[in-house]
């Protein structure tokens, strides 16, 4: 499964919101019930946010993250990180599993 993220780092100012873009190409007949979406800190694998069994499982990252639920069915797995802090800087991995799976990492820089 191909998962796309921007090659360039996402740059955000402290205190603002950042969108970590991630997308995949759903096959015809794709249902959200089939989707496992896991956002993690790339190096430690710490859970950030997840979607499974047709439901948003919520933020595991200081309650400052959100998905775009209305866009998931179209293959938009992007993550919104609110009130960015200096400590948020680093790499986030978007892991998507339907029948097959794939993952890609996006870098966040805090200015």
């Amino acid at each position: 499964l191909e998962v796309q993220v921007p090659e360039d780092p996402v740059v955000a100012l402290v205190g603002t919101d950042a969108t970590l873009c991630c997308s995949f190409s759903p096959e015809p007949g794709f249902s959200l019930a089939q989707l496992n979406l896991i956002w993690q800190l790339t190096d430690t694998k710490q859970l950030v946010h997840s979607f499974a069994e047709g439901q948003d499982q919520g933020s595991a990252y200081a309650n400052r993250t959100a998905l775009f639920p209305d866009l998931l069915a179209q293959g938009n797995a992007s993550l919104r990180l609110q009130r960015v802090r200096v400590a948020d800087e680093g790499s986030f991995t978007c892991f998507v599993s339907i029948r097959d799976f794939g993952s890609a990492a996006v870098s966040l820089q805090v200015a």
């Epitope: 191909e2 430690t44 694998k45 997840s50 499974a52 799976f101 993952s103 990492a105």
Partner: antibody, heavy 116, light 108 residues
Framework: QVQLQESGPGLVKPSGTLSLTCAVS?????????WNWVRQSPGKGLEWIGE???????NYSPSLKSRVTISIDKSKNQFSLKLNSVTAADTAVYYC?????????WGQGTLVTVSS | EIVLTQSPGTLSLSPGERATLSCRTS???????LAWYQQKPGQAPRLLIY???SRATGIPDRFSGSGSGTDFTLSISRLEPEDFAVYYC?????????FGQGTKVEIK
């Protein structure tokens, strides 16, 4: 459907370097996936060694980090493991596997014995 | 690193019986971050369950996973002859990814 196949010497001398290659077929190694090495020994069970992404980014198990190198050759659709300064404790079945979280599929595994 | 402890070490059952395998993690993890594998002699492990309860492609529905926090369970509702094997749990909520030591399900 992706298939993996390990290859390399089955016998390595103590203090030498273990070198294995994993050939990927049925799909491109350049896709959005991490490629891993896992080993299995009677003493330590299943142990993750490390992973590589097609960009060349690597992550290694802290316990093996000082001795491990994983590389990727996209032109040959394969990735490789090098483990140096081996001892008898490195005797194990070595598997390659795909995945950032869970592992699927796996290669069939290759037994590497460290002995003089 | 997170240590996974599986119990029992060996489970002796007859075909048709129900098998219940336990996996305990040394730290609490989200259920979405646990997988189960089956391994038969001379073969590589095969993914059975991911996300604690989602069956991998081609896995029969007699296999089911459940649990949360530190306690997870793999259940096989009615053992078939081909189910006698070793089963491993694995966590991917913390690096390095780690496995349990395995539970052997053998024919009684």
């Amino acid at each position: 459907q992706v298939q993996l196949q390990e290859s390399g010497p089955g016998l390595v001398k103590p203090s030498g370097t273990l070198s294995l290659t994993c050939a990927v077929s049925g799909g491109s190694i350049s896709t959005s996936n991490y490629w891993n090495w896992v080993r299995q020994s009677p003493g330590k069970g299943l142990e993750w060694i490390g992973e590589i992404y097609p960009t060349g980014n690597t992550n290694y198990s802290p316990s093996l980090k000082s001795r491990v190198t994983i590389s990727i050759d996209k032109s040959k659709n394969q990735f490789s493991l090098k483990l140096n300064s081996v001892t008898a404790a490195d005797t194990a079945v070595y598997y390659c596997a795909r995945g950032y979280n869970w592992f699927d599929p796996w290669g069939q595994g290759t037994l590497v014995t460290v002995s003089s | 690193e997170i240590v996974l402890t599986q119990s029992p070490g060996t489970l002796s059952l007859s075909p048709g019986e129900r098998a219940t395998l336990s996996c305990r993690t040394s730290q609490s993890i989200n259920a979405i971050l646990l997988a189960w594998y089956q391994q038969k002699p001379g073969q590589a492990p095969r993914l059975l369950i991911y996300g604690a309860s989602s069956r991998a492609t081609g896995i029969p529905d007699r296999f089911s996973g459940s649990g949360s926090g530190t306690d997870f369970t793999l259940s096989i509702s009615r053992l078939e002859p081909e189910d006698f094997a070793v089963y491993y749990c694995q966590q991917y909520g913390s690096s390095p990814r780690t496995f349990g030591q395995g539970t052997k399900v053998e024919i009684k």
